[in-house]
C-alpha cells in the first residue's frame, strides 16, 4: 500500500555539520510499529544512511554508532544527521514503513537536498 511522505526540498547543514529536517507521513491510522529509513542518493547511487524502528508513542532508537538521531510526534519524525562534510552533500530520502498492524504500508519522500559546506580553517594568528 502506498503512503504519501512529505519532507523539505532543501536544508543547509550547520557549520558543525549537522542537518535537521521533518519527515511527515500521511498515515491511514495509528500504526503501532513504524520503521524510518534515511537513504542518500548521489551520482545515481542510493545508500542507506540510517534506520530505526519505533513503537508508536516511544522514541526512535538508532544504533549507537549511527549518525542519525530523531524524535517522533504523531505522524511526524524529526530527523537529525550529524558529522556531515562537504562530500556528504546529496539528496536524503525519507522512507517510512508501517510494519504493524497489517497491512504493510510504504511511503517514500521526494528527498531533501542537504548542502554541506566545510568550514574555512581559521587563519594562524600572530597574537
Amino acid at each position: 500500500k502506498a503512503m504519501h511522505v512529505a519532507q523539505p526540498a532543501v536544508v543547509l547543514a550547520s557549520s558543525r555539520g549537522i542537518a535537521s529536517f521533518v519527515c511527515e507521513y500521511a498515515s491511514p491510522g495509528k500504526a503501532t510499529e513504524v520503521r524510518v529509513t534515511v537513504l542518500r542518493q548521489a551520482d545515481s547511487q542510493v545508500t542507506e544512511v540510517c534506520a530505526a524502528t519505533y513503537m508508536m508513542g516511544n522514541e526512535l532508537t538508532f544504533l549507537d554508532d549511527s549518525i542519525c538521531t530523531g524524535t517522533s510526534s504523531g505522524n511526524q519524525v524529526n530527523l537529525t544527521i550529524q558529522g556531515l562534510r562537504a562530500m556528504d552533500t546529496g539528496l536524503y530520502i525519507c522512507k517510512v514503513e508501517l510494519m504493524y498492524p497489517p497491512p504493510y504500508y510504504l511511503g517514500i519522500g521526494n528527498g531533501t537536498q542537504i548542502y554541506v559546506i566545510d568550514p574555512e580553517p581559521c587563519p594562524d594568528s600572530d597574537f
Epitope: A26, S27, P28, G29, K30, P101, P102
Partner: antibody, heavy 118, light 107 residues
Framework: DVQLQESGQGLVKPSQSLSLTCSVT?????????WNWIRQFPGNKLEWLGY???????YYNPSLKNRISITRDTSKNQFFLKLNSVTSEDTATYFC???????????WGQGTTLTVSS | DIVMTQSQKFMSTSVGDSVSVTCKAS??????VAWYQQKPGQSPKPLIY???YRYSGVPDRFTGSGSGTDFTLTISNVQSEDLAEYFC?????????FGAGTKLELK
Amino acid sequence: DVQLQESGQGLVKPSQSLSLTCSVTGYSITSGYYWNWIRQFPGNKLEWLGYIGYDGSNYYNPSLKNRISITRDTSKNQFFLKLNSVTSEDTATYFCARNYYSGYFDFWGQGTTLTVSS
Amino acid sequence: DIVMTQSQKFMSTSVGDSVSVTCKASQNVGTYVAWYQQKPGQSPKPLIYSTSYRYSGVPDRFTGSGSGTDFTLTISNVQSEDLAEYFCHQYDTYPLTFGAGTKLELK
C-alpha cells in the same frame, strides 16, 4: 476494488436481538485492517459501534455496554453484528466499513435500514 | 469520549463560491481527523484524512487544515455536486467519534 455489502433484518421487535451480516469482496478480512459497524440515526448522527480485527480481536463502543457482539466467518469472508435487547433508540441505518487500526474509514457498505417497532 | 462539534448545521453557498466547514474537538486529537461527504441515500465517502491529505480521486478544490482541536474543510469553487452533508471524524482515540454534520445548501 474492495466492496462491502450489508444484509439482515429490516424490522425487529423491542427487546429482541438484531443480526446483520457484512459480506466483503476484493480483500480477505484476515489479511489486515479492522472491520467495523457504524450506525446513522434519523437526523444523520453517526455512531461507531465496534470492530473485529484481521486477527479476530474486538473492541466495542462502551456506550453499548454488554449488548453488542461482532463475530466473523473467515471461510465466507463475512463479519456480523449482533445487538441484544433493542429499543426504538436502535432504529438507524447500519453501515459496515473498513479502517486501518485507529484510522479513518476508507470503504463503506451502502447501509441497511433497521427499524425497531412492535 | 471525544466530542467533535460542528457548530453550523447548515451552510448556504453559491456555485463558484468558497466555503469553510469547521469542526472543534473537545481535546487534542493531533492530526488524526478525517472528513466525509454524504449525499442522500448514500454512504459517507472519504474526502480528507490525516487533517490535510486528499483521499484518492478527490478534486483539489477540497482542502483540509488544522491541528490539535480546530479543523477546517474548505471547498473552493463550489460545484453543484458538492451540495451534500459533511462530517468530521476523529480517529485519535477509541471510541472513534464523528461530528453532527454540516449540510451545504444553495443560497
